[in-house]
């Protein structure tokens, strides 16, 4: 309706004497801003005066004066949308209707709000879920239709008068829609909480009691049971009687059915609170409990372990493990049903009693072949001795024993011979099925356990065989001791380590990798000439003339072997330098003269330097110095210097004579 002012606020607000009331409020005027506001208590419209009568709790005046009452009542709104009010403290006689008289420049409006103030604090209200079951989490809610900024309060939860440990979540609402304080408590009730009193207590800021609400918990739970047994230790002998009684300590709702279970399985036709077992047998040993159900579900008692005692039954032997490997450990277990458990055991190996073995288990840490055979046992408890059952067979397996490799040939063996070997052993379990040989080669095995090596190599030093069943047993290697001529003969320079320079002390070594027999002789040769018969060839001061191709020979009683030819290279500084002149040392002016620096050097000369009779270097660095046309002034002594990576050498002086030509002489 466009002719109405629009207000939003809670319809009714609740408080108590001495507290306060906070009224959240919004509005929209028909036109323009608010010019006048009066808060009435129980306003009545006077038709005669066309005005409202009633107690004025608050009035906004144009001169700005505030009546004393306005200290208690505050208008917290504004001129266009907020009309929030606060009354602090609030009194019992404030109950009733509050009238908000609003006037704009052209329009007027009276808005009514209900205020309910009680004499003392009213109680909160506890809300419970429709059904509570044990161990299922529920939320308890405590709601109070009150909240005010000027009057802090708290809600506390109690169980049977004792504060609850669980943390509660408190929330407040002060909105135009609702005003309340709420506390929510999450709680997992147990069956023992059934019938207990829960209280929500309203307290002021100092924790002083103001009011409360209480509820009694109705916790649905399965029946809670206790079981009693006669005899109390539940240990009997075959033929005795046993009585078990089931008592219900709590059930909500009431129980409906009763049953008994043995080892988790229901016993037929046992639907009373007492279970009588007459003349029990050993099969009736087990775990018993009673089960009582209600609408929530079944409840079970604790289990009673009924033990029916009897003498040991015929025993069996379990072997861990058979067949057993020699050297491994084996455990024998005597298995015999008995109650109480057997206290003594007697063990037999191949029918003969094993002394000192009285335990349920026999442990042999290291099995040997003689441990094989049949094992049996007898068990004994306080009620008697059992019978010896069928025995268990232990099979002890072991690798082949005392394996040897035998050479069938006459000794010594020479490189290239045919060699036959056999592989022998003493005993084996299981039987030998194959043989292996080390090292592996492309060799013949003419029959099982025999090896034939055609054209035996110089390096066939040792051979070993293995006889194999599930395992291989290796014989000690046998030395073939193959005899051969010296091998891998080579010349090795041992001094100097780097390149050989003229004047160095040089040692060459005649190396070979192996020889059998070891006794050897050496021979050195250069260009077919015998030089020495030692393993080393030494030069105290090597000269360029010692360069050349060297070989060494090593021989033993089987044969002789030569090295590859080894080239000895001697590095030396330029030597034997001389200046040669072409066409000769006397040349006519105007012709061409070529001076050549001749030298002997290793490595070759890298560059030359030419000098004149004044020791002045000439700007020429090649081997030849060409003077063209030659002049009389070129006459004189020349010398050259050659340089390589080893060093330097220089020539003696050579004199060039340049004589005048007939033309020059004619002109004079």
């Amino acid at each position: 309706d466009s002719s109405k002012w629009v207000f939003e606020h809670p319809e009714t607000l609740y408080a108590w004497e001495g507290a306060c009331v906070w009224i959240p409020c919004t509005y929209r005027a028909l036109d323009g801003d608010l010019e006048s506001f009066i808060l009435f208590h129980n306003p009545e419209y006077n038709k005669n005066t066309s005005k409202f009568d009633g107690t004025r709790l608050y009035e906004s005046t144009k001169d700005g004066k505030v009546p004393s009452e306005q200290k208690r009542v505050q208008f917290l709104g504004d001129k266009n949308k907020n009309c929030t009010l606060s009354i602090h403290p609030v009194h019992l006689n404030d109950s009733g209707q509050l009238g908000l008289r609003m006037e704009s420049k052209t329009e007027k409006w009276m808005e009514r709000i209900h205020l309910n103030v009680s004499e003392r604090p009213f109680p909160p209200h506890i809300q419970l879920p429709p059904e509570i079951q044990e161990s299922q989490e529920v939320t308890l809610t405590c709601l109070l239709n009150f909240s005010c900024y000027g009057y802090p309060i708290q809600l506390q939860w109690l169980l049977e008068g004792v504060p609850m440990r669980q943390a509660a979540v408190t929330s407040t609402s002060l909105t135009i829609k609702s005003v309340f304080t709420r506390s929510e408590l999450k709680f997992s009730p147990q069956w023992s909480h059934h019938g207990k009193i829960v209280t929500c207590q309203l307290q002021d800021a100092d924790g002083k009691f103001l009011s409360n609400d209480t509820v009694q918990l109705n916790v649905k739970h399965t029946p809670k049971l206790e079981i009693k047994v006669t005899p109390s230790d539940a240990i009997v002998r075959e033929g005795d009687s046993v009585t078990m009684t089931c008592e219900v300590s709590s059930s909500n709702p009431e129980y409906t059915t009763v049953s008994w279970l043995k080892d988790g399985t229901s016993l037929k036709k046992q639907n009373t609170f007492t279970l009588n077992l007459r003349e029990v047998t050993k099969d009736q040993s087990g775990k018993y409990c009673c089960q009582v159900s209600n609408d929530v579900g079944p409840g079970r008692s604790e289990e009673v372990f009924l033990q029916v005692q009897y003498a040991p039954e015929p025993s069996t032997v379990q072997i861990l493990h058979s067949p057993a490997v020699e050297g491994s450990q084996v455990e024998f277990l005597c298995m015999s049903l008995a109650n109480p458990l057997p206290t003594n055991y007697t063990w037999y190996h191949n029918g003969k009693e094993m002394q000192g073995r009285t335990e349920e288990k026999v442990h042999i840490p290291k099995i040997l072949p003689w441990h094989a055979g049949t094992y049996s046992c007898v068990a004994e408890n306080i009620l008697g001795t059992g019978q010896r059952g069928p025995g268990a067979e232990l099979d002890v397996q072991y690798p082949p024993k005392k394996v040897t490799t035998v050479i069938q040939n006459p000794m010594p063996i020479r490189e290239g011979d045919t060699v036959t070997l056999s592989c022998n052993y003493n005993s084996s379990n299981p039987s030998v099925t194959r043989y292996e040989w080390k090292p592996h080669g492309a060799w013949e095995e003419p029959s099982l356990g025999v090896l034939k090596i055609q054209n035996v190599g110089w390096d066939n030093t040792t051979i070993a065989c293995a006889a194999c069943n599930s395992w291989c047993s290796w014989a000690s290697p046998v030395a073939l001791n193959v005899q051969y001529a010296p091998r891998d003969v080579r010349v090795r320079k041992i001094k100097p380590l780097s390149e050989i320079h003229s004047g160095n002390s040089v040692s060459l070594q005649c190396d070979f990798s192996s020889s059998h027999p070891k006794e050897v002789q050496f021979f050195w040769e250069k260009n077919g000439r015998l030089l020495g018969k030692e393993s080393q060839l030494n030069f105290d001061s090597i000269s360029p003339e010692d360069a050349g191709s060297y070989s060494c020979w090593v021989n033993n009683s089987i044969g002789q072997t030569a090295s590859k030819a080894w080239t000895l290279e001697v590095l030396y500084a330029p030597r034997r330098l001389r200046v040669s002149m072409s066409p000769g040392d006397q040349v006519m002016e105007g012709k061409s003269a070529t001076l050549t620096c001749e030298s002997d050097a290793n490595p070759p000369v890298s560059h030359y330097t030419w000098f004149d009779w004044n020791n002045q270097s000439l700007p020429y660095h090649s081997q030849k110095l060409r003077l063209e046309p030659v002049k009389v002034q070129h006459s004189g002594a020349y010398w050259c210097q050659g340089t390589n990576s080893v060093g330097k050498g220089r020539s003696p002086l050579s004199t060039l004579t340049v004589y005048y030509s007939p033309e020059t002489i004619g002109r004079r």
Partner: antibody, heavy 122, light 107 residues
Framework: QVQLQQSGPGLVKHSQTLSLTCAIS??????????WNWIRQSPSRGLEWLGR?????????DYAVSVKSRITINPDTSKNQFSLQLNSVTPEDTAVYYC????????????WGQGTMVTVSS | DIQMTQSPSSVYASVGDKVTITCRAS??????LAWYQQKPGLAPQLLIS???TLQGEVPSRFSGSGSGTDFTLTISSLQPEDFATYYC?????????FGQGTKLEIK
């Protein structure tokens, strides 16, 4: 009158590179009758020739075997100088380093630089 | 490498004395031998090259002789400025090598 002026750091860290320069005045690094050398002196090894560079139609180098794998001597014709680089130095390389001119035909060191004391710190 | 051995390692003499220092090469170095003088904190200074050629500004009291493997440096009449360390050096083979030095000290 030929003069040689050395420059470069006096302290080098272990395993780093020693670099020195020798500036020539009064002659050319490309001279056809001179060679340019580096020599060092230490109490333990005395005077030790390290190597040389020289020009005879092309550039040549000769190095001492003891440092051959670590040494480089380079001429710089644009600045008329030559340099020494010695890699992977150790405290054993601590010495006074000299540059020197060698002149044919006697091939002796007639002009020396002022010397640079180089310490290798570990 | 060519070994250069100087003897003696040190020599004590007075002003006006004649002093002889010898240098032996482990191999023939022809005439490629030089002699140097070094004073503390300074670079060596060339005295003689080619075994016997005196450098331009070196006083005539210094002389050198020898060829092949054995060489000699002679100072005919010692002057106060001659007290220093003297080194020989071969220049025939690479690497060039120096003697260990002879220290000339005032008696």
């Amino acid at each position: 009158q030929v003069q040689l002026q050395q420059s470069g750091p006096g302290l080098v860290k272990h395993s780093q590179t020693l670099s020195l320069t020798c500036a020539i005045s009064g002659d050319s690094v490309s001279s056809n009758s001179a060679a340019w050398n580096w020599i060092r002196q230490s109490p333990s090894r005395g005077l030790e020739w390290l190597g040389r560079t020289y020009y005879r139609s092309k550039w040549y180098n000769d190095y001492a075997v003891s440092v051959k794998s670590r040494i480089t001597i380079n001429p710089d014709t644009s600045k008329n100088q030559f340099s020494l680089q010695l890699n992977s130095v150790t405290p054993e390389d601590t010495a006074v380093y000299y540059c020197a001119q060698e002149v044919e035909p006697h091939d002796a060191f007639d002009i020396w630089g002022q010397g640079t004391m180089v310490t290798v710190s570990s | 490498d060519i070994q250069m051995t100087q003897s003696p390692s040190s020599v004590y003499a007075s002003v006006g004395d004649k002093v002889t220092i010898t240098c032996r090469a482990s191999q023939d170095v022809s005439g490629w031998l030089a002699w140097y003088q070094q004073k503390p904190g300074l670079a060596p200074q060339l005295l003689i090259s080619g075994a016997s050629t005196l450098q331009g500004e070196v006083p005539s009291r210094f002389s050198g002789s020898g060829s092949g493997t054995d060489f000699t440096l002679t100072i005919s009449s010692l002057q106060p400025e001659d007290f220093a360390t003297y080194y020989c050096q071969q220049a025939k083979y690479f690497p060039y090598t120096f003697g260990q030095g002879t220290k000339l000290e005032i008696k």
